[in-house]
């Protein structure tokens, strides 16, 4: 029985050659976090796995910081970094959480952050 | 629970288009996932040919993008693959399937395809 | 494209025996491989994910492992029922790549 729910930061906009911090927060379950993975439709950007510790992609290993916490720092953005983002919580005995974060990149100077909501 | 169900032609002509459908019943394909087409030739190889996500957009293999297009009717619940210029290399066993993040977690049973004049 | 080895064609054993395929990634995948089974006439079916996650309702004799580019599958007690091809997918990027396969046969 899967209870927890996943809350991330929604959606965000951000300025172009900027940061941003994706963030999820799993709560209402006891479960073990074994790996979070931080992922796009087409690929993996990382991996934060309990026993082997950090993974960055290759492709993102210049712009990509792990963390604060389980999150992922998005560096030096560009406007096609705009997109949908996935945080993927491994769990045990649960299963796997997922939560969705709607990135927009923005050329102007108004960059205003979105609320926060829940996906259960 | 999902399924999907492949159909298509069985038989087409080299230098000829290529289409099948999935239909897919049990969950909307706009709701979640990645709805991909797989195919395994004989000798039981799989290729990845390529899907489309649940708000619309594609993906395709590289060694095919030329060739293929991913479609779908939301209304019908149906996603679709179109192959142009076929040749015999194109014989298979083509599968639609479910996946969420490049993993295929439910497939279909599989429709024959053989490219032949 | 990242390409996936399975370096046994075919593999022999028998019943209540413990048995591991193996799958080599050309390049560091991290933990983004899945496992799937095909049994003769059927389509495919996923049982591991993300290296060593059992799919909803997988028996737990299945088991996954395995990091970076070297990755395990194993039946800890082979059950006629498991007589069938086994093949690894890298889930790291598109395109998707699976191994040619390993066809477990009885000795």
């Known amino acids: 029985m899967m209870t927890g729910t996943i809350e991330t930061t929604g959606n965000i906009s951000a300025e172009k050659g900027g940061s941003i911090i994706l963030q999820c927060h799993l709560s209402s379950t006891t479960a073990q976090v074994t790996q979070v993975n931080w992922e796009q439709q087409d690929q993996l950007l990382a991996i934060c796995n309990a026993d082997l510790g950090w993974h960055i992609s290759p492709s993102f290993k210049d712009r990509v910081a792990p963390g604060p916490g389980l999150g992922l720092t998005l560096q030096s953005l560009t406007v096609n970094d705009t997109g949908e983002y996935f945080c993927i919580y491994h769990t045990y005995p649960d299963g796997t959480y997922t939560g969705r974060i709607f990135l927009e990149v923005l050329e102007s100077s108004v960059a205003e952050h979105g609320a926060r909501f829940q996906i259960p | 629970d999902v399924q999907l169900q492949e159909s298509g032609p069985g038989l087409v002509k080299p230098s000829q288009s290529l289409s099948l459908t999935c239909t897919v019943t049990?969950?909307?394909?706009?709701?979640?996932?990645?709805w991909n087409w797989i195919r395994q030739f004989p000798g039981n190889k799989l290729e990845w040919m390529g899907y489309?996500?649940?708000?619309?957009?594609?993906s395709y293999n590289p060694s095919l993008k030329s060739r293929i297009s991913i479609t779908r009717d939301t209304s019908k619940n149906q996603f679709f693959l179109q192959l142009n210029s076929v040749t015999t290399e194109d014989t298979a066993t083509y599968y639609c399937?479910?996946?969420?993040?490049?993993?295929?977690?439910?497939w279909g049973q599989g429709t024959t395809l053989t490219v032949s004049s | 494209d990242i390409v996936m080895t399975q370096s046994h064609e075919f593999m022999s054993t028998s019943l209540g025996d413990r048995v591991s395929i193996t799958c080599k990634a050309s390049?560091?995948?991290?933990?983004?491989v899945a496992w799937h089974q095909q049994k003769p006439g059927q389509s495919p079916k996923q049982l591991i994910y993300?290296?060593?996650y059992r799919y909803t309702g997988v028996p737990d004799r299945f088991t996954g492992s395995g990091s970076g580019t070297d990755f395990t599958f194993t039946i800890s007690n082979m059950q006629a029922e498991d007589l069938a091809v086994y093949y690894c997918?890298?889930?790291?990027?598109?395109?998707?790549?699976f191994g040619a396969g390993t066809k477990l046969e009885l000795k």
């Open positions: 399937a479910r996946g969420w993040f490049r993993r295929p977690d439910y």
């Open positions: 390049q560091d995948v991290s933990t983004a």
């Open positions: 049990g969950y909307s394909i706009t709701s979640d996932y990645a």
């Open positions: 997918q890298q889930h790291y990027s598109v395109p998707l790549t």
């Open positions: 489309i996500i649940y708000s619309g957009s594609t």
């Open positions: 993300s290296a060593s």
